[in-house]
Interface confidence: low
């Protein structure tokens, strides 16, 4: 017969899980021993594994609720293609029966005693109720039993007394205006309302109770704008480190306007948020060296030659300079301390000369003394020999410029009886007086 085939068998509940499908034979379904089958939907689920006993079911309820009874439980041989221990076929149930007792004895009814006296009326004025009671002890019930009917009964009673009128509050009056126009100030704004003990008033005879509670109440006003809070300075912060490693610097302290922060249109803190101090490292700053001006050129000479004056023989000369003022690990002067150049020596050489044009007029001398004059000159200028302007001293080092050096002896035709300099002098006109400009202002 075809069966419903499932992929899982749940041991704890004995249920089939994971329906694979129907219309297959048990033999085909149980090709996989992990599978399970049902002969019809909702029927007994049998696993495909070899048969074995299921877990025992829980005990059924005791057959009686009081005194001794008995109860059953069962297990089933579940599986396919074989038998359970005891040569039992799959599907067979095995039962167990045991004695049980939910409650040792069965309940027994009790009987009522006679009614007790009536209690006083429930009120001291006007009409109320009164109550009387009886006990379930004639006889007492056994094993959780009870008496039938009620343990107490009530009836109406009349005190023949007029009741006093107790006071009750009339409705609250309107809220008064707020005691302040903003909240957060020194006094919290409040509004107040009052009520009267007049709905009704307490009676005089017999005396009624006054109204409970207070005749007025207060509450915080809502919807008010916050009061402005003026800002206050916090403490000065730490002094910043001196920003320089030598000489004087400036350190700073800062404070914040947050003690409190200005709020709701309150003014900002008055005064400065920062203050500065001079800090003294007491360490002098480095002073960089500076070159002095170049010294005089040394005489133009050539090694191993006594003199090269007045000859077309290039020589060399040098000049030096001093690096001054370097202190406290300042930078040394950049560049060369010595300057070397190539030269032709025309020191004391007799050279043909020619007269220059007139120079421009010089300054008036003396500037503040009597009768100042100015002068101009014509000079006997030497005509330099046409030696090569560049030379190649060492092969492969290229051409080097050659400079004429020395004071030659120029020879010119006499001019106005002079051989070297002709000077013309003129008086300076309309000379102003020399006055201290500072004194002039006074």
């Amino acid at each position: 017969d075809p069966v419903l085939c499932f992929t899982q068998y749940e041991e704890s509940s004995g249920k089939c899980k994971g329906l694979l499908g129907g219309g297959v034979s048990v033999e085909d379904c149980c090709l996989n021993t992990a599978f399970a089958y049902q002969k019809r939907s909702g029927g007994l689920c049998q696993p495909c594994r070899s048969p074995r006993w299921s877990l025992w079911s829980t005990w059924a309820p005791c057959s009686v609720t009081c005194s001794e009874g008995s109860q059953l439980r069962y297990r089933r041989c579940v599986g396919w293609n074989g038998q359970c221990s005891g040569k039992v076929a799959p599907g067979t149930l095995e039962w167990q029966l045991q004695a049980c007792e939910d409650q040792q004895c069965c309940p027994e009814m009790g009987g009522w005693s006679g009614w007790g006296p009536w209690e006083p009326c429930s009120v001291t004025c006007s009409k109320g109720t009164r109550t009387r009671r009886r006990a379930c002890n004639h006889p007492a019930p056994k094993c959780g039993g009870h008496c039938p009917g009620q343990a107490q009964e009530s009836e109406a009673c009349d005190t023949q007394q007029v009741c006093p009128t107790h006071g009750a509050w009339a409705t609250w009056g309107p809220w008064t205006p707020c005691s302040a126009s903003c909240h957060g100030g020194p006094h919290e704004p409040k509004e107040t309302r009052s009520r009267k003990c007049s709905a009704p008033e307490p009676s005089q005879k017999p005396p009624g109770k006054p109204c409970p509670g207070l005749a007025y109440e207060q509450r915080r006003c809502t919807g008010l704008p916050p009061c402005p809070v003026a800002g206050g300075w916090g403490p000065w912060g730490p002094v910043s480190p001196c920003p320089v490693t030598c000489g004087l610097g400036q350190t700073m302290e800062q404070r914040t306007c947050n003690h409190p922060v200005p709020q709701h249109g309150g003014p900002f803190c008055a005064g400065d948020a920062t203050r500065t101090h001079i800090c003294n490292t007491a360490v002098p700053c480095p002073v960089d060296g500076e070159w002095d001006s170049w010294g005089e050129w040394s005489p133009c000479i050539r090694r191993n030659m006594k003199s090269i004056s007045c000859q077309e023989i290039p020589g060399q000369q040098s000049r030096g300079r001093t690096c001054r003022g370097r202190k406290f690990d300042g930078h040394r002067c950049a560049g060369q301390q010595q300057d070397i150049r190539h030269c032709y020596s025309i020191q004391h050489c007799p050279l043909k000369g020619s007269w220059s044009e007139w120079s421009t007029w010089g300054l008036c001398m003396p500037p503040c003394g009597p009768n100042p004059t100015r002068a101009r000159q014509r000079l006997c200028t030497p005509l330099l020999p046409k030696y090569p302007p560049t030379v190649s001293m060492v092969e492969g080092q290229g051409e080097k410029n050659v400079t004429f050096w020395g004071r030659p002896l120029p020879r010119c035709e006499e001019l106005q009886g002079q051989k070297l300099v002709v000077e013309e002098k003129r008086p300076c006109l309309h000379v102003p007086a020399c006055k201290d400009p500072e004194e002039e202002e006074l």
């Epitope: 000489g247 003294n280 007491a282 360490v283 002098p284 700053c285 002073v287 003022g325 202190k327 406290f328």
Partner: nanobody
């Protein structure tokens, strides 16, 4: 350029006095700050006293305060160190130094040998116990 020559050193008993002089060549003596330094045997050179170009500021090492006095005479191009109440620990070679007046000032500056541009050869002072 300034050339400095110290004089006045010698041997003296503890508690005695000496006056050291330092003569400077050059016309611009009055524009230099002057200092006295000393080098005890086997120790490093240390500051003794200094005087600014005008004489308006004078600085002393703590060890000589109240006993030594520095002064200058710009007309004679000379700086002096008057040493009283001498102690054996004052034994040293005493050097005179000149500093071209700079933009720096303050005791720390004048107490540093590096601050000075020109130095004398030194004069020996020995104080016996």
């Amino acid at each position: 350029q300034v050339h400095l020559v110290e004089s006045g050193g010698g041997l003296v008993q503890a508690g005695g006095s000496l006056r050291l002089s330092c003569a400077a060549s050059g016309r611009t003596f009055s524009s230099y700050a002057m200092g006295w330094f000393r080098q005890p045997p086997g120790k490093e050179r240390e500051f003794v006293a200094a005087i600014t170009w005008s004489g308006s500021s004078i600085y002393y090492a703590d060890s000589v305060k109240g006993r030594f006095t520095i002064s200058r005479d710009n007309a004679k191009n000379t700086v002096y160190l008057q040493m009283n109440s001498l102690k054996p620990e004052d034994t040293a070679v005493y050097y005179c130094a000149a500093e071209e007046t700079s933009k720096y000032s303050g005791s720390y500056y004048y107490m540093m040998g590096d601050s000075y541009d020109y130095w004398g050869q030194g004069t020996q002072v020995t104080v016996s116990g």
